[in-house]
Interface confidence: medium
């Protein structure tokens, strides 16, 4: 078993013979360079001291010395194989190799998990030359280890296009459990089961999970990470979190609130944005959604007139954009308006009712029973009518507009007359003899001019003709009445 900050295998002396396991002060390095880019300067080396057999890559030199002895194989010395330490601690490890001085252009580089470590790493290479060999120690240090420093580190050296690779040094950074998945806030239906997930990792493993609901542990016995808690259902809001334990200690997840879906609160601040004769544009501020998105809203409209039958008109609309134009209303009428909205659970109560009024509108119908006749003696045309029904006046009558069009051979002229609201008859002067006069009447309120009545035509003879019967609004279906006298 490996315990924190102890080596799995003891390092062997770096240099048997003249190089003791711990370097002595009288062996001052010839050169000490920071390993900034993975590049090492070319140096001359002399033959190595025999080292311990090695499992890494070995370069067997083909060159022989002056005495023609074959050179021993080149290999990195064995060193610590596995370093375990806590997060934020410092660590330093090294590779060492003795290289004959006959070799030039050697470089040592550090690699982690198959990728070369370039740039601002704390790597230093020291050189200890002797008559025949130069001992090289490549050190790598990390001042404050993080989880991301976990991995397998190796040294590589290139000599004459041969690559020598050291045994790996495994760095294991241990710390408190680290959450990879924490429970999420949820909005749930009352008494309906739901799942929460919690996952945490070491090292060290294993990581055990305890669930906490409203500050009380759900499970007295721990579960292994990852853990899923199935809650059979809640009747009120609860806060859940999970605790992750390993040999280093405890980490607590964020607390998440599980809300119970409910019917929404009623909308507030229903207000009138615009009124016309037959429509009212309202807006409202939605109430609390009950932890479930609004689906739609219902606008309830009832006549405020105490004599009305009290029936309620209902208009359904989407929940957004909190605006609705209520149409098909009567002009100059008072209404009570309330709004209710729904989510998946149900409908809210109705908002406080507000009073709203429509404005005056132009009359929606024309005057009825229009009658036209010629008073030859006074050379006038008399017109009579009945005012439109009060409900359809859509406001207070201020008068009538009479259109009379005179047509004879090659001539057509239209004249407009305004008459006061009290009358139901008018007299207009004959404009052209031996012509047809076409009369139409519209009721007028402050809201505008209503529709004109169907045209009534009367023929005005030349002077000296006798006065005959009147012309009147035709029965439905007769579109073009003409009374020829």
């Amino acid at each position: 078993a490996i315990t924190e900050a102890r080596e799995e295998a003891k390092p062997y002396p770096l240099f048997p013979g003249p190089f003791p396991g711990s370097l002595q002060t009288d062996h001052t390095p010839l050169l000490s360079l920071p390993h900034a880019s993975g590049y090492q300067p070319a140096l001359m080396f002399s033959p190595t001291q025999p080292g311990r057999p090695h499992t890494g890559n070995v370069a067997i030199p083909q060159v022989t010395s002056v005495e023609s002895k074959p050179l021993p194989p080149l290999a990195f010395k064995h060193t610590v194989g596995h370093i375990i330490l806590s997060e934020h601690k410092g660590v330093k490890f090294n590779c060492s190799i003795s290289v004959p001085n006959i070799y030039q252009d050697t470089t040592i580089s550090w690699w982690k998990d198959g990728k070369e470590l370039l740039g601002a790493h704390h790597a230093i290479t020291q050189f200890y030359p002797d008559d025949e060999v130069t001992a090289i120690i490549a050190s790598f240090s990390i001042t404050s280890v993080q989880r991301s420093d976990n991995g397998s580190y190796i040294c590589k050296m290139k000599i004459n296009n041969e690559e020598i690779v050291s045994d790996p040094i495994y760095i294991e950074v241990q710390g408190l459990p680290h959450f990879t998945k924490q429970p999420e806030s949820m909005n749930v239906t009352r008494n309906t089961a739901f799942n929460l997930t919690c996952q945490a990792v070491g090292p060290p493993e294993p990581v055990n999970i305890f669930w906490v609901q409203n500050s009380s542990r759900v499970n007295e016995q721990p579960e292994k990470s990852p853990s899923v808690l199935t809650v059979p259902g809640l009747t009120e809001m609860a806060v859940f979190s999970c605790e992750a334990h390993n040999d280093k200690g405890l980490t607590v997840s964020k607390g998440v609130q599980i809300n119970i879906k409910a019917i929404p609160s009623p909308p507030t601040e229903v207000s009138i944005r615009n009124s016309t004769a037959h429509s009212i544009l309202i807006s409202w501020v939605p109430g609390f959604d009950g932890y479930s998105p609004f689906r739609n809203c219902s606008i309830q409209v009832k006549e405020a007139d105490p004599l009305s039958n009290g029936s309620v008109m209902i208009f359904n609309t989407s929940a957004l954009p909190h605006l609705y134009q209520i149409k098909q209303l009567q002009a100059l009428a008072n209404y009570s308006i309330g709004v209710s909205c729904m989510n998946e659970i149900g409908w809210s109560a109705v908002s406080p009712w507000i009073l709203a009024s429509t404005t005056e509108g132009a009359p929606s119908v024309a005057p009825l029973n229009v009658t036209v006749f010629l008073n030859e003696s006074s050379d006038n045309v008399d017109i009579r009518w009945m005012k439109p029904p009060t409900k359809q006046q859509d406001g207070e009558l201020v008068g009538y507009r009479i259109s009379h069009v005179w047509q004879s051979a090659g001539i057509s002229k239209e004249l407009l007359e305004e008459v006061g609201q009290n009358g139901s008859r008018a007299r207009i002067s004959v404009q052209v003899h031996n012509a047809t006069c076409t009369v139409r009447i519209a009721a007028v309120t402050r809201g505008g001019v209503g529709p004109f009545s169907d045209p009534v035509k009367i023929f005005i003879p030349a002077h000296g003709w006798v006065d005959y019967a009147p012309s009147s609004t035709p029965a439905p279906g007769n579109a073009d009445p003409v009374l020829i006298i």
């Epitope: 294993p206 808690l229 199935t230």
Partner: antibody, heavy 123, light 107 residues
């Protein structure tokens, strides 16, 4: 098909110890809790405890602490329960049972059971 | 520890009839599981997490309940359903106790 194969019947003397085995197959043994349950003749079921083979973690029913020791061997996919200082009260059928559901569900029910090992304690 | 009381202790039913047995907990539990055991055999999981049918179990079996009161129902009794039925709780605190069992016989 998940299977739990338990060792055969045991006849032991009072005061002795016995080790019962439960060999699992066709599932990831190291990642599911293995539970042990006792059933006395003509009686109901009693939960003894459980072990997580992945790391040897154990939980016990307080009544069986000191009586039962749970172990597991991942290499052979086998769980063991050792019972010591046996008395006639320990005569029963002992079942191993796998924790059901997906291995990381916190609910604890038993979806697969061994065939049972009969232990008789008699002088 | 939580105590589970099953009732009735023994009951008999004719084929085709509906059978309901109950399991009452001494305090509220999160889930109830149900097992069937026939003489000389191991228990068999029927219902887990209160109402979920275990694999291979006929749909005539169903479970329900919450809090301290749970029940197991067989919609139409069959001869092969004669057995002893045990409830087992999962709650906040161990141990995972079993009820005393309900023995169901065929009439």
């Amino acid at each position: 098909q998940v299977q739990l194969q338990q060792s055969g019947p045991e006849l032991v003397k009072p005061g002795a110890s016995v080790k019962i085995s439960c060999k699992a197959s066709d599932y990831e043994f190291s990642r599911s809790w293995m539970n042990w349950v006792k059933q006395r003749p003509g009686k109901g079921l009693e939960w003894i405890g459980r072990i997580y083979p992945g790391d040897g973690d154990t939980n016990y029913n307080g009544k069986f602490k000191g009586k039962a020791t749970l172990t597991a061997d991942k290499s052979s996919n086998t769980a063991y329960m050792q019972l010591n200082s046996l008395t006639s009260e320990d005569s029963a059928v002992y079942f191993c049972a796998r924790k059901g559901g997906y291995y990381y569900s916190i609910s604890n029910y038993f979806d697969y059971w061994g065939q049972g090992t009969t232990l008789t304690v008699s002088s | 520890q939580i105590v589970l009381t099953q009732s009735p202790a023994i009951m008999s039913a004719s084929p085709g009839v509906k059978v309901t047995m109950t399991c009452s907990a001494s305090s509220s539990v999160s889930y109830m599981h149900w097992y069937q055991q026939k003489p000389g055999s191991s228990p068999r999981l029927l219902i887990y997490d209160t109402s979920n049918l275990a694999s291979g179990v006929p749909v005539r079996f169903s479970g329900s309940g919450s809090g301290t009161s749970y029940s197991l129902t067989i919609s139409r009794m069959e001869a092969e359903d004669a057995a002893t039925y045990y409830c087992q709780q999962w709650s906040s605190y161990p141990p995972y106790t079993f009820g005393g069992g309900t023995k169901l016989e065929i009439k």
